[in-house]
Each structure stands twice: as structure tokens, then as C-alpha cells.
């Protein structure tokens, strides 16, 4: 029933291993409440084997993605790149296949991969030096037996280029958190040929030691907690092994730089978090009210004392008891573990509050999303327009623009018979994408659908990432449809943050054929329906300037609910003029980010509002019209009686009361609506 294709994208070839990772359905995997009790067999201690290489690569400290950088740095306008050396994880001892990090580890940036183990476990690290000079693998936890032998020579602490060395040690109790501390404790591993130069060159990574029975056997991590390691340090490129080479790259002859010039020195020092400056560290994405553990690391001289602050949030430290804190002082060589329950959705900042560091860019953003904010992004409704949907090709008239959930007709989907195909949606702005609903289509009497697919995504349309999510493989293979009409809802956990999303069929029936909807939200998790359609907003909360009634029907304000059915299923005013209004009282201040409007059809007559104004009030007495760019905004409403039209409010309104003022209409003023937004949050 299934035809199989290998993946090839339009912009690059993606290598991935053929192991299909089982889709994480709610019943299989739940990051919030997975039972971590393991069978008695799991008490047998294991050896955890990591394949890690020192690999040289170019690094720009996130400067190419930051709009602020060149303002602060005396550069020629081009972003400088620095050769660095990093710890890179590989799939096996052949060191040919690097391990793709995926969303959960994207935040590590320049850091090496997590090495995790429980007390009494053995850790085995096979280290290969793929760099051009000697490096080592070292952690203060490693006990070198030869050091204990009487009269032994000092250990040979370097591995030459293209050499491989295996390190093996047992995790002792003194390395682990005490019973009064959090489940896992952070250490670091690094290279110590020349500790200072090696770290400034980029060789450092997090090593986590956990209580017994903490790590999930399948995932090798604690699945009930989301973990983030943040390494605060000043990377000084003048102390890197590659300083001379980087100078030549970034300052081509004739180069007039004076080494002792303070401006030059500052331009080669990067106040970074995981090797990123100025809010550019990616991957700090977490769910509201989900337990988050931060491992805070610092290395270097005494200038690397940092005062860590998470805006809008407090965190806890645990030393016998738990203490709530808003600020943590981090000292060089100290690795601290703190936990947080992010209570407020939105985009927040983690930063070092010490002036010099903060000014130089030692801050980054973290995104807290609400799992409640999962609405259709507009494939079915048409809010996502035809031009936003493109594909590698199409079969006949089965065009990408038809790939809309529930679309009907004899040709009613995207379809292609080509292998290595893809379909792409441009959301026009970065969004949180929580999931995808897919459907096949019928041609004649046959069933065409995609049974397995992978997802790729991008913020800029150039650099693409393959979605890995919670998969234990190198990427997530999603199971799609089994017929032409059923809807399969696949959830992205963690969600995808992207402007562009691309679906690549890997297995299909007859031809790759798709109708779909994307489920998601804006980056602030603030475009949820506030309750008109669901009736969370009660009838009493909806009022109007007047309403039309006759012996057959009453078109009262409480009927102004999106998709309402019935004989009288909308609000209509008593008379049609621009002074009429419909009002919603949210009963508390809400953040309103959009309105969805819909007309109605009555006795074969289509009625709808073509243009409207919006006003808001905090007290129900004083009203302010919504302005944009210095003038009253006239919103473009409906063009028929049935299709919902979404209008965004930018900037959002913080209001208790909202009014819609119809300004032009077809036949009669008639309105069904939904308000989009979220609860207004106190900032502190």
C-alpha cells in the first residue's frame, strides 16, 4: 500500500539514518507526567558510551543574526568569523556521522553535547581529535589511575590530531547531588592542554550527574524536566589558539590594527552565553508551568563573576530547603543548578546584570509558550493565502494551494508523483507551530495519501533544520494517513518556532497527496479564542447599541458568535447605520491581538460587514478608537456571508471592553465574531 521515497530537499541534501523513530503520541510519551519508575532490571548499572570529537569550525557569536552588533563593534560592515574548536558528538566510533542536535539541545550553541550519567554508572568517552593541533578530554570527575601509582609519570594530557583515546570512569557518590539537592548536578568537561587557551578556543561542555533512576532509559535524559545549560563567559579571541589565523581572516592586508588598542581588544572579546551574544542564542523554548532546570556555568578569571537574572520569573535553589531567588551570583569555576516553573507565556530575557557584561551583550531571550494556544493557522480558512503555499512540483492541476484541510471538489488537494517532493508554507512571520493535521484525497474511486513524512523548518528560508523533537533517532518520522478522508493530528513536542515549514513525504499511497492544517500560535502565545464561539463569554457579556427583532426571529447581541447555526444566528442592529456597535465585556483586562468576523445568510440573502472600526475602554464609559500609524484604523471585514476573516491588532489592545463599529456592509449589518488574545499579565 505504501510507496517509499528517500528524502532530498530543494536546498540541500539531508542525511538521516533509516531508523524510523516511533511517533510520540500522548499515550506513548508525555513530557509532563511520564512515569519514571523503572523495572528492577534498570537497577543494574550501565556504561554510558559517548563518541566525542574536537572539530574545528567557523563561529560568529550570533553576530550575523543580531541587528545590534555592528552598531557596537567597530567593524567594516561584514560580520567577522572566527575559527574555533568544539566538542562534537558522533553516532559511533567511526566518527563519520555527526549527531544532529535537534530542538532540545539547540541551546547548547558552542558547548559540547550533554554527558549524562547516574551514580554508580560508568562513563566511557571515546575522544577523537579531528582538529589541527593537540587537545584533550578532561573533567575533574575523571580519576586517572596512573596518577595514583607511586612514581608514575604525569599523565599524557593531549591527543594528537587524528588520534583517538578512550576515557573510562565510574561516577562516585561525591560527584552526585546530595539527597537535599535537585535530581541532577552540573559539572564541565574541557580540554586541558592549556586550559585557558583551550576554553577560549571553544572546548567546553556540560556533564550532568544524577540521582539513581533519574534518567529515562530510552531517551537518556530526565523527561519530566526540561534542561538548559548556560555557560556565561567572556571569550577572548586574543587567547585562542587560532588568534593569528583569525586576525588574518578578519583584518586583511594592509591591516593597521594596533594590538594594544583598547578598541581592538574589546572587538576580540565576546561577552557570551553558550557562545552567542546580544539575544541570539537559539533554542530556549519551554512550556508554561513545566518544570525547567537551568545549569549555570562560568569559567575564567575573576572578571567572569556574573549576576544572573531571568526577567519576569523567579527561580529556586535547593540546599536542604528550596529558596526562591530573582538573582544568582555565579563565580568562575562554579556550576550551579536552579529550577523554575515559568508561569507567564511570552518572550523573556536571561541576562547578566553586571553593567559591562550586559552592555556588551551577555543576554539572550527565552520563549515560554502556552499549550492552550493551539489554533488553526489558516490553511482551511484561507487566512494562509495561496501564494504562501509552494511545492517542489505538482501533478496536473493538483496544486499546492489546494492543500487545505477539508477542501472539496474533484481536484481538492496537492498531489505529486515525483519522488523527493516537498510542500512548503510561508507563515510570513515566525510562529509557534504546535502540530499538523493531515488528510489525503480521493481521485475517482481511489485513495491517495501520505503515510509517513518528515518536517523541516526555517526562520529565513535559507537555513533549514530537520525536526527531531523527542525522537531517539536523528530525526522524527511522523505517521500520517491511512486513507483519503481521515484526519491525522501529529503534535510537535517541543513545538517548532519557524516562519517556513516544509513537509517531505517519505512513504505514500499511489501519489503523495495532501490536505493539511497547521496548529499553532503567535510567539507570545496570545492569539487564543477568548470565548465567543465556545460560550466562555456569556450572553450577558455581549451587548449592543440595538438589535433587530420581528415575529420570526430575534437577532440579539448574544447571537454574534462565530459559526453559530440556527434561524437567527448573528447580531443585527435595529437599523443599519455607522453609529451601531456590538460590545464585549471580558470582565477583566485582556490582551486582545485580533478579531475574527463572519457574516450570515438569511432567507437566501447574504449579509455581512465589509468595514468596521474598533474601540476599547477600561471602564465602559470612556472609549478610544483603535489607531494605527497615527490615524483611525479601518478594518477590512468580510467579502461573503460565510468565510471568517481574521484581522490582527498591532499593537495589541489591553482592555476590558471592546466594541465593533460597522462602517460599510452588504444588504444588512450582520455579525458573528470571535476575539483573539490572552489574559493580560503583570510584568515585574
Amino acid at each position: 500500500e505504501i510507496t517509499r521515497t528517500t528524502l532530498q530537499s530543494d536546498q540541500e541534501e539531508i542525511d538521516y539514518d533509516d531508523t524510523i523513530s516511533v511517533e510520540m503520541k500522548k499515550e506513548d510519551f508525555d513530557i509532563y507526567d511520564e512515569d519514571e519508575n523503572q523495572s528492577p532490571r534498570s537497577f543494574q548499572k550501565k556504561t554510558r558510551h559517548y563518541f566525542i570529537a574536537a572539530v574545528e569550525r567557523l563561529w560568529d557569536y550570533g553576530m550575523s543574526s543580531s541587528p545590534h552588533v555592528l552598531r557596537n563593534r567597530a567593524q567594516s560592515g561584514s560580520v567577522p568569523q572566527f575559527k574555533k574548536v568544539v566538542f562534537q558528538e558522533f553516532t559511533d566510533g567511526s566518527f563519520t556521522q555527526p549527531l544532529y542536535r535537534g530542538e532540545l539541545n539547540e541551546h547548547l550553541g558552542l558547548l559540547g553535547p550533554y554527558i549524562r550519567a547516574e551514580v554508580e554508572d560508568n562513563i566511557m568517552v571515546t575522544f577523537r581529535n579531528q582538529a589541527s593541533r593537540p587537545y584533550s578530554f578532561y573533567s575533574s570527575l575523571i580519576s586517572y589511575e596512573e596518577d595514583q601509582r607511586q612514581g608514575a609519570e604525569p599523565r599524557k594530557n593531549f591527543v594528537k590530531p587524528n588520534e583517538t583515546k578512550t576515557y573510562f570512569w565510574k561516577v562516585q557518590h561525591h560527584m552526585a547531588p546530595t539527597k537535599d539537592e535537585f535530581d541532577c548536578k552540573a559539572w564541565a568537561y574541557f580540554s586541558d592542554v592549556d586550559l585557558e587557551k583551550d576554553v577560549h578556543s571553544g572546548l567546553i561542555g556540560p556533564l550532568l550527574v544524577c540521582h539513581t533512576n533519574t534518567l529515562n532509559p530510552a531517551h537518556g535524559r530526565q523527561v519530566t524536566v526540561q534542561e538548559f545549560a548556560l555557560f556565561f563567559t567572556i571569550f577572548d579571541e586574543t587567547k585562542s589558539w587560532y588568534f593569528t589565523e583569525n586576525m588574518e581572516r578578519n583584518c586583511r592586508a594592509p591591516c593597521n590594527i594596533q594590538m594594544e588598542d583598547p578598541t581592538f581588544k574589546e572587538n576580540y572579546r565576546f561577552h557570551a552565553i553558550n557562545g552567542y551574544i546580544m539575544d541570539t542564542l537559539p533554542g530556549l523554548v519551554m512550556a508554561q508551568d513545566q518544570r525547567i532546570r537551568w545549569y549555570l556555568l562560568s569559567m575564567g578569571s575573576n572578571e567572569n563573576i556574573h549576576s544572573i537574572h531571568f526577567s519576569g520569573h523567579v527561580f529556586t535553589v535547593r540546599k536542604k530547603e528550596e529558596y526562591k531567588m530573582a538573582l544568582y551570583n555565579l563565580y568562575p569555576g562554579v556550576f550551579e543548578t536552579v529550577e523554575m516553573l515559568p508561569s507567564k507565556a511570552g518572550i523573556w530575557r536571561v541576562e547578566c546584570l553586571i553593567g559591562e557584561h550586559l552592555h556588551a551583550g551577555m543576554s539572550t531571550l527565552f520563549l515560554v509558550y502556552s499549550n492552550k494556544c493551539q489554533t488553526p493557522l489558516g490553511m482551511a480558512s484561507g487566512h494562509i493565502r495561496d501564494f504562501q503555499i509552494t511545492a517542489s512540483g505538482q501533478y496536473g492541476q493538483w496544486a499546492p494551494k489546494l492543500a487545505r484541510l477539508h477542501y472539496s471538489g474533484s481536484i481538492n488537494a496537492w498531489s505529486t508523483k515525483e519522488p523527493f517532493s516537498w510542500i512548503k508554507v510561508d507563515l510570513l512571520a515566525p510562529m509557534i507551530i504546535h502540530g499538523i493535521k493531515t488528510q489525503g484525497a480521493r481521485q475517482k474511486f481511489s485513495s491517495l495519501y501520505i503515510s509517513q513524512f518528515i518536517i523541516m523548518y526555517s526562520l529565513d528560508g535559507k537555513k533549514w533544520q530537520t525536526y527531531r523533537g523527542n525522537s531517539t533517532g536523528t530525526l522524527m518520522v511522523f505517521f500520517g494517513n491511512v486513507d483519503s478522508s481521515g484526519i491525522k493530528h501529529n503534535i510537535f513536542n517541543p513545538p517548532i518556532i519557524a516562519r517556513y515549514i516544509r513537509l517531505h513525504p517519505t512513504h505514500y499511497s499511489i501519489r503523495s497527496t495532501l490536505r493539511m492544517e497547521l496548529m499553532g500560535c503567535d510567539l507570545n502565545s496570545c492569539s487564543m479564542p477568548l470565548g465567543m464561539e465556545s460560550k466562555a463569554i456569556s450572553d450577558a457579556q455581549i451587548t449592543a447599541s440595538s438589535y433587530f427583532t420581528n415575529m420570526f426571529a430575534t437577532w440579539s447581541p448574544s447571537k454574534a458568535r462565530l459559526h453559530l447555526q440556527g434561524r437567527s444566528n448573528a447580531w443585527r442592529p435595529q437599523v443599519n447605520n455607522p453609529k451601531e456597535w456590538l460590545q464585549v465585556d471580558f470582565q477583566k483586562t485582556m490582551k486582545v491581538t485580533g478579531v475574527t468576523t463572519q457574516g450570515v445568510k438569511s432567507l437566501l440573502t447574504s449579509m455581512y460587514v465589509k468595514e468596521f472600526l474598533i474601540s476599547s475602554s477600561q471602564d465602559g464609559h470612556q472609549w478610544t478608537l483603535f489607531f494605527q500609524n497615527g490615524k483611525v484604523k479601518v478594518f477590512q471585514g468580510n467579502q461573503d456571508s460565510f468565510t471568517p476573516v481574521v484581522n490582527s491588532l498591532d499593537p495589541p489592545l489591553l482592555t476590558r471592553y471592546l466594541r465593533i463599529h460597522p462602517q460599510s456592509w452588504v444588504h444588512q449589518i450582520a455579525l458573528r465574531m470571535e476575539v483573539l488574545g490572552c489574559e493580560a499579565q503583570d510584568l515585574y
Epitope: 500500500e1 505504501i2 510507496t3 501533478y395 496536473g396 508523483k417 515525483e418 519522488p419 480521493r442 481521485q443 475517482k444 474511486f445 481511489s446 485513495s447 491517495l448 495519501y449 486513507d483 483519503s484 499511497s509 499511489i510 501519489r511
Partner: antibody
Framework: EVQLVESGGGVVQPGRSLRLSCVDS????????MHWVRQAPGAGLEWVAV????????YYADSVKGRFAISRDNAKNTLYLQMNSLTIEDTAVYYC?????????????WGQGTLVTVSS | DIQMTQSPSSLSASVGDTVTIACRAS??????LAWYQQKPGKAPKLLIY???RLQSGVPSRFSGSGSFTDFTLTINSLQPDDSATYYC?????????FGGGTKVDIK
């Protein structure tokens, strides 16, 4: 190449019944709409019936409506034609055929046929 | 029902000739037309579907064209192996209907 193989044909008296089968040795049977087409000796082709991929939709030619029943068993990759109240005019070679849907793999769309002779 | 009228009912041509067979539908069938080749004692073989799409494995000397109600099968550079009866089929609406057939002989 994927093969469709019909069976169940033979000589039968008018008014009697016969059941034809068509087995698909390929992997895509459960996705395709399936047809029966017949050809009387020395005559042209005549479409008989169609069934959708899931068995929910069926259509028949007027000449067989009420007498013939098309069905399928996707678990067995098999298409059936139950023929009742046979008449001499039903004498023909019966072919099973797949919906004409283009894919990127070569499909055998027709079987080789099975002969049904209705004779007293 | 949609009637399919095929012409001519038979023709004779020499090897290397170009042969054209016409098929007319009693109403618009968009491009839902297929052409079959049948040799004596054999099952029909699909040549062309969706008016002009060549089935894989079919020589490129066969081509189809047309739209709405008028359709054509063209055989360029006729070969001895092309001696057969050719049928058109509309699969735009039920019941599906075939043309009466065109018998092609090689002189």
C-alpha cells in the same frame, strides 16, 4: 510487474450464479478503486461495475444492475463479482481493472481475463 | 450516458505511415480519456490516459491529444507490431463507456 489474476469463470446455465475473483499481487490494492469490464466474443469492451477503495461506493452498468454485485476484501487483496440470474448475453471474457490513476510506479492496470460462458 | 463514437471502424496502412484515430464524446469529458490497444486473445493494454499522458513502457510513437469532446490517437511511423484493435474510454462519468473500436491492419 504487478499482476491482476482473475479466476472463477466457466460454463454455467442461464438463471444460475457464478462468482469471479481477482487477486492483486501488488502492494497498492487497498488504495485503488477497482472495476470489472467484459468483452463478448467478437464484440467491443463494455464496462460492468466499479467499487471504491474502501468498498463503500459501488456503481453498475444498467445491463447488470440488480443481478451483479461487486465487492472486495482488502485484507486478501481480492476483488469479487457475484453474478446472479445469468443470461446468454452475459457470455464474455471478464477483466478486472484498476482505476486509471497516475503514480510514479508502473502498474498493471488490467488482468488477463476469465471466460464466462452462459449456455443451456 | 456519455456515448463514445470512434472513427474509422477499420483502416489499413503501411509500415512507416502516420495513423490517426478519432474519438468523439456526446458531451464534455474534460481530459478524462484513455486509449487501449488489444490484440486477438489478449487483454487490452493501456497506451494513453488523461488524454495525452503516455503509460510507462509504451513507445513514444504513440501520442494523444484533444479536449472537451474531440480526441485523437496518433501513431507515428507505424510498425508491424501495431496491428491491433484500438479503443477509447471515457472515465469522466459513470457508467464508463468505450468507443466501438478501430481495427488497424498493416498492408
Amino acid at each position: 510487474e504487478v499482476q491482476l489474476v482473475e479466476s472463477g469463470g466457466g460454463v454455467v446455465q442461464p438463471g444460475r450464479s457464478l462468482r469471479l475473483s481477482c487477486v492483486d499481487s501488488g502492494l497498492t490494492f487497498s488504495s485503488y478503486g477497482m472495476h470489472w469490464v467484459r468483452q463478448a466474443p467478437g464484440a467491443g469492451l463494455e464496462w460492468v461495475a466499479v467499487i471504491s477503495y474502501d468498498g463503500n461506493d459501488k456503481y453498475y452498468a444498467d445491463s447488470v444492475k440488480g443481478r451483479f454485485a461487486i465487492s472486495r476484501d482488502n485484507a486478501k487483496n481480492t476483488l469479487y463479482l457475484q453474478m446472479n440470474s445469468l443470461t446468454i448475453e452475459d457470455t464474455a471474457v471478464y477483466y478486472c481493472a484498476k482505476d486509471l490513476i497516475e503514480s510514479n510506479i508502473a502498474e498493471a492496470f488490467w488482468g488477463q481475463g476469465t471466460l464466462v460462458t452462459v449456455s443451456s | 450516458d456519455i456515448q463514445m463514437t470512434q472513427s474509422p471502424s477499420s483502416l489499413s496502412a503501411s509500415v512507416g505511415d502516420t495513423v490517426t484515430i478519432a474519438c468523439r464524446a456526446s458531451r464534455d469529458i474534460r481530459n478524462d480519456l484513455a486509449w487501449y490497444q488489444q490484440k486477438p486473445g489478449k487483454a487490452p493494454k493501456l497506451l494513453i490516459y488523461a488524454t495525452s499522458r503516455l503509460q510507462s513502457g509504451v513507445p513514444s510513437r504513440f501520442s494523444g491529444s484533444g479536449s472537451f469532446t474531440d480526441f485523437t490517437l496518433t501513431i507515428n511511423s507505424l510498425q508491424p507490431d501495431d496491428s491491433a484493435t484500438y479503443y477509447c474510454l471515457q472515465d469522466s462519468d459513470y457508467p464508463l463507456t468505450f468507443g466501438g473500436g478501430t481495427k488497424v491492419d498493416i498492408k
